[in-house]
């Protein structure tokens, strides 16, 4: 464990800093200049620094479970858990699920009535008795309901020609009902005759494009529990179709832009506002179904199985069955799907704030274990065989009191989890002994909490009418700085710098703004190590023989000396045994300047006066040409030929000397003077 803390001045702040942090409440644990924050550290560190084990405050997260034995059949236990959460430290508890036998079932049959489902409708009309019989094999209390859908009644989903709206079927002789989005036909009932009668009245309909408005219909079935008649039992929604589905965004094709609002809009058992709202998104529908504990069974023809299998990956607790072309196998399909659904258990929770994190370890009866998952998941769950989930809840900060529920998807049982913060320190301070705080405050977890008008570690400083802001002001460098640079205590308007636990680090300065460690490093050591230099308030002071911002250079100039032992040829300065040349001159010794302008034109008047004592500088040659020295012998260097003041050509050679603008000049004896026209 580690404890990373920032500006901790109380036990609570320490506990909030992380699960590895503990607080020492021992009196006089801090020495002069020590910050209160040194009371906050890992348990081993505090023990090592002399804090007794019973002086260490280390509240831990814990879970208390309560069983609620009232009410009927319970598949989840416990029913209530109270968690006390310390930030960063998980509290864990077990949830047991025992699948009950004969749990009541509500089954709503939602059928596509587009024209291609004509033969299916014939078979479903005879289905009522078979469906209820099949349910009664599984449960003592089964109910069935019925609804149907086609699509939104605008182009391009249906043909809006008045004749086609009256009778959308391709066969004019066929009796056919106008298209509609969703019709709730039969409320959930245990009367199979009523199912037969109501479904028997249904007529086929038709639409234009291949996908249907099934998601619209499913959303209404989930959003209208009273109208559908859902009980608080296992809820199955059989969705029978031979085609795909429209989803959010498709409404734009029919100029329907308002997003689906996920609310109930049934009037006279019809979804009359379907042309006002777009289709729901798959995620939106999945959320609504889970919220209402509805488990969809997609009964679809063979060519659509793959499509709906993809849908079940997004919708939890859903299943797909292959429907024969005429729906004759639907009862068998529902039985299989129900067995599949009820043998898979997902444990999940409602939405939580970012400050709470929940993970699940699933210990399934077949020996399979899933750890640290965002939800519990066990497959092949058998009747009366308990399975266990370990739920771990972590708070990232000191949370407000709140609660959330955990449910097994598709089942009505819930576990209510109440969450409380575990951030207070129950310190055993010397009652209300004020003597340790100069009688001007009381002890709280080893620290003096001073009365108004007093401040300081032991309330030793009287503010004397000065506000604490004024006193603190003299402990700040400026208004934007923090008190004593955050590295000391402001005691009666003066900074008392903290002692550092970093070896070799001394904090000092009027505002504790300086230390002996925050300087540039060389070879991994501050100022190159104690042999090269020392750190003073952010700057290295190098020992004799060393230089550089981190004392990284030996003070030698050997690499800067030219053959005449002139540093950087007088055209630069030596830093760290390397020349820093003046503009244009090149390393290593600032000897050449290829980019510099030719000096020839600059020195013609000097050549003229030095050699011939003529020209504009004739009278004060040495003052005008201080950097030039006349040579009587030829020199090596730049050869020049320029016109003098009399229009004669003068040839001369400039040999650069050490320094800037210093040359040895050799001037040819003869000038070339061109005679003018006579």
């Amino acid at each position: 464990q580690e404890c990373t803390k920032f500006k901790v001045s109380s036990c609570r702040e320490c506990i909030e800093s992380g699960p590895g942090c503990t607080w020492c409440q021992k009196l006089n644990f801090t020495g002069p200049g020590d910050p209160d924050s040194i009371r906050c550290d890992t348990r081993p560190q505090l023990l090592m620094r002399g804090c007794a084990a019973d002086d260490i405050m280390d509240p831990t997260s814990l879970a208390e479970t309560q069983e609620d034995h009232n009410g009927g059949q319970k598949q989840l236990s416990p029913q209530k858990v109270t968690l006390y959460l310390r930030p960063g430290q998980a509290a864990a508890f077990n949830v047991t699920f025992r699948r009950a036998k004969g749990y009541p079932i509500d089954l709503y049959y939602l059928m596509d009535l587009s024209y291609s489902m004509l033969d299916d409708l014939r078979n479903v009309k005879k289905l009522g008795g078979d469906l209820l019989r099949a349910l009664n094999e599984i449960t003592e209390s089964g109910r069935i309901g019925f609804g149907s859908f086609v699509d939104k009644t605008v182009l391009p989903f249906v043909n809006t020609h008045p004749d086609k709206l009256r009778n959308p079927c391709p066969n004019k002789e066929k009796e056919c009902q106008p298209p509609f989005a969703f019709r709730h036909v039969l409320k959930l009932t245990n009367n199979s005759n009523q199912f037969q009668t109501e479904v028997g009245k249904q007529l086929i309909s038709g639409n234009l494009d291949a996908p249907e408005g099934g998601l619209d219909a499913m959303m209404q079935v989930a959003a209208c529990p009273e109208e559908i008649g859902w009980r608080n039992v296992t809820r199955l929604l059989v969705f029978a179709t031979d085609d795909g589905f429209h989803f959010a965004g498709d409404g734009k094709l029919g100029a329907i832009l308002t997003p689906n609002d996920g609310r109930c809009h049934l009037e006279d058992n019809l979804y009359k506002r379907s042309n006002e709202f777009d289709y729901p998104s798959v995620g939106q529908l999945a959320h609504k179904l889970a919220e209402n504990n509805i488990q969809p069974i997609f009964a679809v023809t063979s060519r659509m199985v793959k499509t709906y299998e993809k849908l079940t990956e997004i919708i939890p607790k859903s299943a797909v069955g292959e429907l024969s072309e005429d729906s004759s196998n639907v009862v068998h399909l529902i039985k299989n799907a129900y067995n599949k659904l009820s043998s898979r258990v997902f444990l999940d929770h409602n939405a939580l704030p970012d400050t709470l994190k929940v993970t699940y370890d699933s210990f399934c009866s077949n020996g399979v274990t899933h750890r640290n998952q965002p939800r519990g998941d066990c497959d092949g769950v058998q009747i009366n065989v308990p399975i266990t989930f370990q739920v771990k809840v972590t708070a990232t900060e000191c949370i407000q009191e709140q609660s959330f529920v955990i449910r097994a998807l598709g089942f009505t049982d819930i576990v209510t989890v109440q969450v409380l913060p575990q951030c207070e320190c129950r310190c055993r301070d010397q009652s209300r002994d004020r003597s340790l705080c100069h009688g001007k405050g009381f002890l709280e977890c080893g620290i003096c909490r001073c009365d108004t008008g007093y401040i300081g570690k032991n309330c030793e400083c009287q503010t004397q009418g000065r506000s604490s802001q004024e006193l603190e002001g003299s402990c700040r460098k400026d208004n934007n700085s923090i008190i004593c640079s955050g590295l000391g205590d402001c005691v009666c308007g003066q900074c008392l710098c903290h002692t550092s636990d970093v070896p070799g680090k001394l904090i000092y300065g009027q505002y504790c703004e300086c230390d002996t460690i925050n300087c540039e490093r060389y070879n991994g050591q501050v100022c190159g190590g104690p042999g090269r230099g020392l750190c003073f308030c952010g700057k290295c002071r190098c020992h004799p023989g060393f230089e550089g911002s981190a004392c990284q250079c030996e003070r030698t100039t050997e690499g800067c000396l030219n053959p005449r032992r002139v540093e950087c040829s007088g055209r630069g300065r030596c830093r760290c045994n390397v020349c820093e040349c003046h503009s244009g001159y090149q390393l290593p010794l600032c000897q050449e300047c290829p980019g510099c302008p030719s000096p020839c034109g600059k020195y013609i008047s000097c050549a003229e006066c030095l050699k011939f004592e003529k020209g504009p500088f004739g009278k004060n040659c040495s003052a005008a040409c201080p950097g030039l020295q006349l040579s009587n012998n030829p020199v090596k260097g730049r050869t020049c030929k320029e016109r003098d003041s009399e229009g004669c050509w003068v040839a001369y050679t400039l040999e650069q000397q050490d320094g800037m603008d210093r040359y040895l000049i050799y001037v040819d004896e003869s000038r070339e003077c061109v005679a003018g026209p006579n």
């Epitope: 690499g559 390397v578 020349c579 090149q586 390393l587 290593p588 010794l589 000897q591 050449e592 290829p594």
Partner: nanobody, 117 residues
């Protein structure tokens, strides 16, 4: 990295001549200046002569007029030493520089020149 190998040293009578050579290998394309240094026993190392890629040469006062530095290609530099004196006795080292960093780190093993009187 550039390697420098000096050769041509030996024992010579005062007034005699020697021609030292320094061959470079490695990444030599960036070298701009080559130089000869020498170190006599118990003395500091001193720069004798330099030559740049442009042909600019520079000599110490003691070498001027007696020694000539030349470069026959980018890779080899020579020091022609005439009128040798006993005080020229030293280990002679070759050194190279780049425009970007100045003198390159490291030295060759040097070549011993001994001038007897």
């Amino acid at each position: 990295e550039v390697q420098l190998v000096e050769s041509g040293g030996g024992l010579v009578q005062a007034g005699g001549s020697l021609r030292l050579s320094c061959a470079t290998s490695g990444s030599v394309s960036s070298i701009n200046v080559m130089a000869w240094y020498r170190q006599a026993p118990g003395k500091q190392r001193e720069l004798v002569a330099t030559i740049s890629t442009s042909g600019y040469t520079d000599y110490s006062d003691s070498a001027k007029g007696r020694f000539t530095i030349s470069r026959d290609n980018k890779n080899t530099v020579h020091l022609q030493m005439n009128s040798l004196k006993p005080e020229d006795t030293a280990v002679y080292y070759c050194r190279a520089s780049t425009l970007r960093t100045g003198w390159l780190m490291g030295w060759g093993q040097g070549t011993q020149v001994t001038v007897s009187s």
